[in-house]
């Protein structure tokens, strides 16, 4: 009896694992083995596919074959008993195009209200992704074990810290990788769970902000208790992208070591141009807080995000505010080539009740003012980029008196 060729051959590639699956074409024939050949582009001869010769099952692994993953290959299969079937040719494919990203490795560390997630590619030193290691981004799904309500976090790198969690609570999460440059989305990791610790005696510092004054950066934060000392550390933001490296060499800012106030001042030349992460820790001599949330600090934006300059035209019931480019030392205007949003705060000079206007335009009307009343105005600029989320300091307040009634034209 003539052997029939096997059918429906599937090629599954996950990371560096190459798996072939196929269907027997004749279940009634026993003791059949299967063998594959492969052919590279531009070659006429077929080569035996190692790992896939005389296979008794309907699955084989040819991961040991050192292929150029960017080069198209063709496979063929036949069944063998006493005689052999005809060859069945599989559609040619490029391994890299066909490959899926496998589940990443996930390593968790817990604090009282935060979890640190370290993510590594599932296959160490992968050949498939050798040129794409730094291009991996990850997304995760996290939920409280008790509730199951899921939160998705997109576009994270090999180290990510999740804050504002509840103490003594078990959180579960799963992570998948993506190579956006190649439109590839990976497979989720297994679910990993970790319990946050009991609440720490000392909370971490909060609301860290960086501003520029003269040639210095001013770093400010809030803290619950008095008589504390603080230290500040920085890290190059790109180091969070480094796959497989989970040693983070946070550096001390010398002028911000063991400071006793909730701010520190350090020269701008401490940092070269770039994007950094900053974090602050508090200590009372006996106990230490966990580190604060890490804030992103872009020297380019920070250096040039100066408070806006504005002019006020006073009417009886409103102010017209014209916002101009801030001035550098030397009175030259700063060119800001990224979109800004302006926050304008105004108040009656005799009162503390502040009102706020947020506006994208550079000419703003402040309505509903009383005639012949002194109002004060201050403004600051914010970048519209959510990730960087930078703000200038407020301008100095400018106070003006509204005109008498009926001068609104």
């Amino acid at each position: 009896k003539n052997l029939k060729s096997p059918q429906k051959v599937e090629v599954d590639i996950i990371d560096d694992n190459f798996i072939l699956r196929w269907n027997r074409s004749d279940e009634s024939v026993g003791n059949v083995t299967f063998s594959f050949d492969y052919q590279k582009t531009g070659m006429d001869n077929w080569i035996k596919l190692s790992g896939c010769q005389n296979i008794t099952s309907t699955k084989c692994n040819f991961s040991s074959l050192k292929l150029n993953v960017y080069e198209e290959i063709k496979l063929r299969i036949r069944a063998e008993k006493e005689n052999t079937s005809s060859w069945y040719e599989v559609d040619s494919f490029t391994p890299f195009r066909k490959a899926q990203i496998g589940p990443p490795e996930v390593h968790l560390e817990a604090e009282d209200k935060a979890i640190v997630i370290h993510i590594s590619p599932g296959t160490k030193d992968s050949v498939m992704w050798a040129l794409d290691g730094l291009s991996f981004t990850y997304s995760l799904v996290i939920w409280k074990n008790s509730s199951g309500v899921e939160e998705r976090i997109e576009n994270i790198y090999s180290r990510h810290k999740i804050y504002k969690l509840s103490p003594e609570t078990t959180y579960c999460l799963k992570v998948k990788a993506a190579l956006l440059t190649s439109w590839k989305i990976g497979v989720y990791s297994p679910v990993h769970c970790i319990k946050t610790t009991v609440e720490n005696e000392l909370p971490p510092p909060e609301n860290i902000e960086v501003s520029v004054q003269n040639q210095n950066y001013v770093l400010k934060w809030d803290y619950t208790y008095a008589n504390m000392t603080f230290q500040v550390q920085w890290l190059h933001a790109f180091l969070k992208r480094n796959p497989g490296n989970h040693l983070y060499k946070w550096k001390q800012i010398p002028d911000c070591e063991n400071v006793k106030t909730t701010q520190c001042v350090f020269p701008q030349n401490v940092f070269q141009k770039g994007i950094y992460l900053l974090r602050v820790q508090a200590s009372d001599g006996n106990n230490t807080s966990f580190w604060s949330e890490e804030i992103k600090f872009d020297t380019e934006i920070q250096a040039f995000l100066l408070p806006p300059v504005f002019n006020i035209r006073s009417l009886s019931d409103s102010f017209h505010i014209y916002i101009g480019a801030p001035k550098q030392s030397g009175n030259t205007p700063v060119i800001q080539d990224y979109p800004l949003i302006y926050e304008i705060i105004f108040w009656e000079n005799t009162s503390n009740a502040e009102r706020k206007i947020i506006e994208k335009k550079t000419d703003v009307t402040v309505p509903n003012l009383k005639p012949l009343t002194v109002y004060c105005v201050k403004a600051r600029a914010h970048t519209m980029d959510e990730k960087l989320n930078k703000s200038s300091v407020f301008s100095d307040a400018v106070c003006e008196k509204t005109k008498p009634g009926n001068t609104s034209k």
Partner: antibody, heavy 118, light 107 residues
Framework: EVQLLQSGAELVKPGASVRLSCTAS????????LHWVKQRTEQGLEWIGR????????KYAPKFQGKATITTDTSSNTAYLQLSSLTSEDTAVYYC???????????WGQGTSVTVSS | DIVMTQSQKFMSTSVGDRVSVTCKAS??????VVWYQQKPGQSPKALIY???YRYSGVPDRFTGSGSGTDFTLTIGNVQSEDLAEYFC?????????FGGGTKLEIE
């Protein structure tokens, strides 16, 4: 293969100084931290301090501030521990260790025995 | 400095038994704890990191647990080669500090 090879045993007089070395192979020390740990006979482990060989930044345990100085020579992939004003309390085995992923001291040298005696 | 206390200096066990070594931190250190094993005449070797992750090549009879201030190293099915001293260490805050060690004796 990752290895940390430490210099040989030292017998030194009280008040003197000593410099121990630790030569790394199988990795570039600039990519890691290097720590030094003290162990007295039949006693526990004490962390002395660490260095980032990339820029020479050091951290010390308060107890060893002024007593210990950690340096590196990146061209020879070597770390050094200098101990000054030695007393009998400094008699111990000193280990050099690599600070790797997750800040784990993942590889340890064989230890250098320092004996302070007149 | 954070004090790591291993209250039991010695523990006696038999081959095949299950034994737990404990360690207490003087303040919350999250899960930033490492366990080391030091066999007689040898250098220490990392066993468990981040409180519960087994270091590569470490047999699965070694498990770590705990968080905050209380940590445990458990050896299930103790083998004669587990005769050693076990140290915990916190890596939450400088200076890093070690526990005083627990010597495991095998009867």
């Amino acid at each position: 293969e990752v290895q940390l090879l430490q210099s040989g045993a030292e017998l030194v007089k009280p008040g003197a100084s000593v410099r121990l070395s630790c030569t790394a192979s199988g990795f570039n020390i600039k990519d890691y931290y290097l720590h030094w740990v003290k162990q007295r006979t039949e006693q526990g482990l004490e962390w002395i301090g660490r260095i980032d060989p990339e820029d020479g930044e050091t951290k010390y345990a308060p107890k060893f501030q002024g007593k210990a100085t950690i340096t590196t020579d990146t061209s020879s992939n070597t770390a050094y521990l200098q101990l000054s004003s030695l007393t009998s309390e400094d008699t111990a085995v000193y280990y050099c260790t690599r600070g790797g992923n997750y800040d784990v001291m993942d590889y340890w040298g064989q230890g250098t025995s320092v004996t302070v005696s007149s | 400095d954070i004090v790591m206390t291993q209250s039991q200096k010695f523990m006696s066990t038999s081959v095949g038994d299950r034994v737990s070594v404990t360690c207490k931190a003087s303040q919350n250190v999250g899960t930033y704890v490492v366990w080391y094993q030091q066999k007689p005449g040898q250098s220490p070797k990392a066993l468990i990191y981040s409180a519960s992750y087994r270091y590569s090549g470490v047999p699965d009879r070694f498990t770590g647990s705990g968080s905050g201030t209380d940590f445990t190293l458990t050896i299930g099915n103790v083998q004669s080669e587990d005769l050693a001293e076990y140290f915990c260490q916190q890596k939450n805050t400088y200076p890093f500090t070690f526990g005083g060690g627990t010597k495991l004796e095998i009867e």
